[in-house]
Interface confidence: medium
């Protein structure tokens, strides 16, 4: 129903400290470089219209969309040109081409320094003396970095953070209750916030059919008993609400979330018999919990898919009269068979029904040429499970860290082009998947696997979109979604590289290293380790691993040493010149 | 849950018309992919017309196109079947089916509908 003013009506269903956190999120993610105190500020005048506009719905103003509303708040900040060039030319605009133009200058490697934790005491004193102020702080960092997380799952994120500092800081020993538990919230906000670009991706790109094919295998895999109809009507109402926090309405997006969390909790019977958990938790916790949650127990008496997708006389007929309902009852038949099988899969596989019909339906025998569909869905399957078996293989005999360097070896040698950061931060990302999916069982390791690198390498794609170098990551990202992952596993060295030369000081290394924690020590290393690949394309294993025991011994060595500035300056050409030879 | 009630059935003169009606509660009928079946006297339950959920998309019977029509009323939620030119050979016991959540009728198999009604006679006789 439509509402005198937009602005009240969204402050009455979220209530003040979500109206206020979403704005400021909202704010954070259109202008990245802002201050927390800039932001604060205009949350706070937006936040006191808002109120005037419930106190009375015919005041100045309190009929402009949130757009303008917010739009304007953001044109009125000063210096806009000096600090964010371009960008400010949006102002010139009329909406709704002012917010299009707000969210293509949206960066997703915006050059801001890593978000640090402060030490437990300190965390503890500044959250104690306004908790406000301390969450405020976190939403604004967090948003500003990832300038596409979903915004209600972000502060659910950071209601989660209020919860452990009100725990941890009651504690004698406050860093080890801490150090745990925000380190568990920070990883799983970070895949949530590359899942969450996907679909954004997903919906920029190819629009929200996409989108709603990607949400009805999903929801059909997690919810098998719930029927078509149900499923279609969640796959509808979560596309809006993504579309909405992927185009910067993040109150709209909230509200409607909110409202799918509570048609879900009224209508169990009908979709799963597992929410009843979920449902008895307070909004921002259910909501999360819904979304994660696990998949109903599948139906026992499914007939074989191919009694209506194959064997059935009217194929053609139902696929002609309509195309797009017939292939998500195909999606949804076939996906709450398998929740073994990744979304990417799924969809593979949807694709390829498709093109078979395509083919088919215009031939003379078309059930002849449609019969062995099924059959061809084989080798589709097979790649992934293998993808699968071989990773998880070898995540099981290096660990993570030896995992990831295997991963960064193979696609530093796939696009030796692209900056050596950017490898490294995707062969981190990549490798984590050993540790987030291969201790899963068996029936779900295809899924978490396939799922996360599709999200990873999403991310890989953004970034290179930005400056293009490679011509075999820009062939991967310009495919569909779904067929990237594939393209990345089959590329293999780029024979159209030309070796960087050597530098001896890519490979210099200083004492300071030593007193690194341990990530920034083996991000150290990982730079070595693909420049090195950069220097020398088709290195073999052997040598890649001798070069690297050899720096890991020199590191070991001169970081025990009495004299490490002397051990460094000494040992470290020694190493240059050893890895220099191994290579040749 | 999907309640089925058929009604209209009767004796009919061959070449005579009869209208049976198929009333659902527990489920909006458009939503549901819906079908006619018949059974004579030891045998099987055949398929005699359907229609798709959420896509008026109809299908009939050889033995039946051209004079039987499918079709629902969403508003009163009820399915109908208009028979005309009856043959003795419609002689049967007729049954509506539904799947729910189906879009489409994909299948004429009966074992694929979970729900059905009590059924109607329908005697064509002279």
């Known amino acids: 129903e439509a509402h005198k003013s937009e602005i009240a009506h969204r402050y009455n269903d979220l209530g003040e400290q979500h109206f206020k956190g979403l704005v400021l999120i909202a704010f954070s993610q259109y202008l990245q470089k802002c201050s927390y105190d800039e932001h604060a500020k205009l949350v706070q005048e937006v936040t006191d219209f808002a109120k005037t506009c419930v106190a009375d719905e015919s005041a100045a103003n309190c009929d402009k969309s949130l757009h303008t509303l917010f739009g304007d708040k953001l044109c009125a900040i000063p210096n806009l040109r000096e600090n964010y060039g371009e960008l400010a030319d949006c102002c010139t605009k009329q909406e709704p081409e002012r917010n299009e133009c707000f969210l293509q200058h949206k960066d997703d490697n915006p050059s801001l320094p890593p978000f640090e934790r402060p030490e437990a005491e300190a965390m503890c004193t500044s959250f104690k003396e306004n908790p406000t102020t301390f969450m405020g702080h976190y939403l604004h960092e967090v948003a500003r970095r990832h300038p596409y997380f979903y915004a209600p799952e972000l502060l659910y994120y950071a209601e989660q953070y209020n919860e452990i500092l009100t725990q941890c800081c009651a504690e004698a020993d406050k860093e080890s209750c801490l150090t745990p538990k925000l380190d568990g919230v920070k990883e799983k906000a970070l895949v949530s916030s590359v899942r969450q670009r996907m679909k954004c991706s997903s919906m920029q790109k190819f629009g929200e059919r996409a989108f709603k094919a990607w949400a009805v295998a999903r929801l059909s895999q997690t919810f098998p008993n719930a029927d078509f109809a149900e499923i279609t009507k969640l796959a509808t109402d979560l596309t809006k609400v993504n579309k909405e926090c992927c185009h910067g309405d993040l109150l709209e997006c909230a509200d409607d979330r909110a409202e799918l969390a509570k048609y879900m909790c009224e209508n169990q019977a009908t979709i799963s018999s597992k929410l009843q958990t979920c449902c008895d938790k307070p909004l921002l916790k259910k909501a999360h919990c819904l979304s994660e949650v696990e998949h109903d127990t599948m139906p026992a008496d499914l007939p074989a898919i191919a009694a209506d997708f194959v064997e059935d006389q009217e194929v053609c007929k139902n696929y002609a009269e309509a195309k797009d309902v017939f292939l998500g009852t195909f999606l949804y038949e076939y996906s709450r068979r398998h929740p073994d099988y990744s979304v990417s899969l799924l969809l593979r596989l949807a694709k390829k029904y498709e093109a078979t019909l395509e083919k088919c339906c215009a031939e003379a025998n078309p059930p002849a040429c449609y019969g062995t569909v099924l059959a061809e869905f084989q080798p589709l399957v097979e790649e992934p499970k293998n993808l699968v078996k071989t990773n998880c293989d070898l995540y099981e005999k290096l660990g993570e860290y030896g995992f990831q360097n295997a991963i960064l070896v193979r696609y530093t040698q796939k696009a030796p082009q692209v900056s050596t950061p950017t490898l490294v931060e995707a062969a981190r990302n990549l490798g984590r998947v050993g540790t987030k999916c291969c201790t899963l069982p068996e029936d779900q390791r295809l899924p978490c696997v396939e799922d996360y690198l599709s999200a990873i390498l999403n991310r890989v794609c953004l970034l290179h979109e930005k400056t293009p170098v490679s011509e075999h990551v820009t062939k991967c990202c310009s495919g569909s979604l779904v067929e990237r992952r594939p393209c990345f596993s089959a590329l293999t060295v780029d024979e159209t590289y030309v070796p960087k030369e050597f530098k001896a000081e890519t490979f210099t290394f200083h004492s300071d290293i030593c007193t690194l924690p341990e990530k920034e020590k083996q991000i150290k290393k990982q730079t070595a380790l693909a420049e090195l690949v950069k220097h020398k394309p088709k290195a073999t294993a052997e040598q890649l691993k001798t070069v690297m025991d050899d720096f890991a011994q020199f590191l070991d060595t001169c970081c025990k040493a009495a004299d490490k500035d002397t051990c460094f300056s000494t040992e470290g050409p020694n190493l240059v010149t050893r890895c220099k030879d191994a290579l040749a | 849950e999907v309640q089925l009630l058929e009604s209209g059935g009767g004796l009919v003169q061959p070449g005579g018309s009869l209208r049976l009606s198929c009333a659902a509660s527990?489920?909006?009928?458009?939503?549901?992919?819906v079908a006619w079946f018949r059974q004579a006297p030891g045998k099987g339950r055949e398929f005699v017309a359907g229609i798709g959920g959420g896509v008026d998309i109809t299908y009939y019977a050889d033995s039946v196109k051209g004079r039987f029509t499918i079709s629902r009323d969403n508003s009163k939620n009820t399915l109908y079947l208009q028979m005309n030119s009856l043959r003795p050979e419609d002689t049967a016991v007729y049954y509506c089916?539904?799947?729910?959540?189906?879009?489409?009728?994909?299948?004429?198999?009966?074992?694929?509908?979970?729900?059905w009604g009590q059924g109607t006679l329908v005697t064509v006789s002279s």
């Open positions: 089916g539904a799947r729910p959540g189906r879009p489409l009728i994909t299948s004429k198999v009966a074992d694929l509908y979970p729900y």
């Open positions: 527990g489920r909006y009928i458009d939503e549901t992919a």
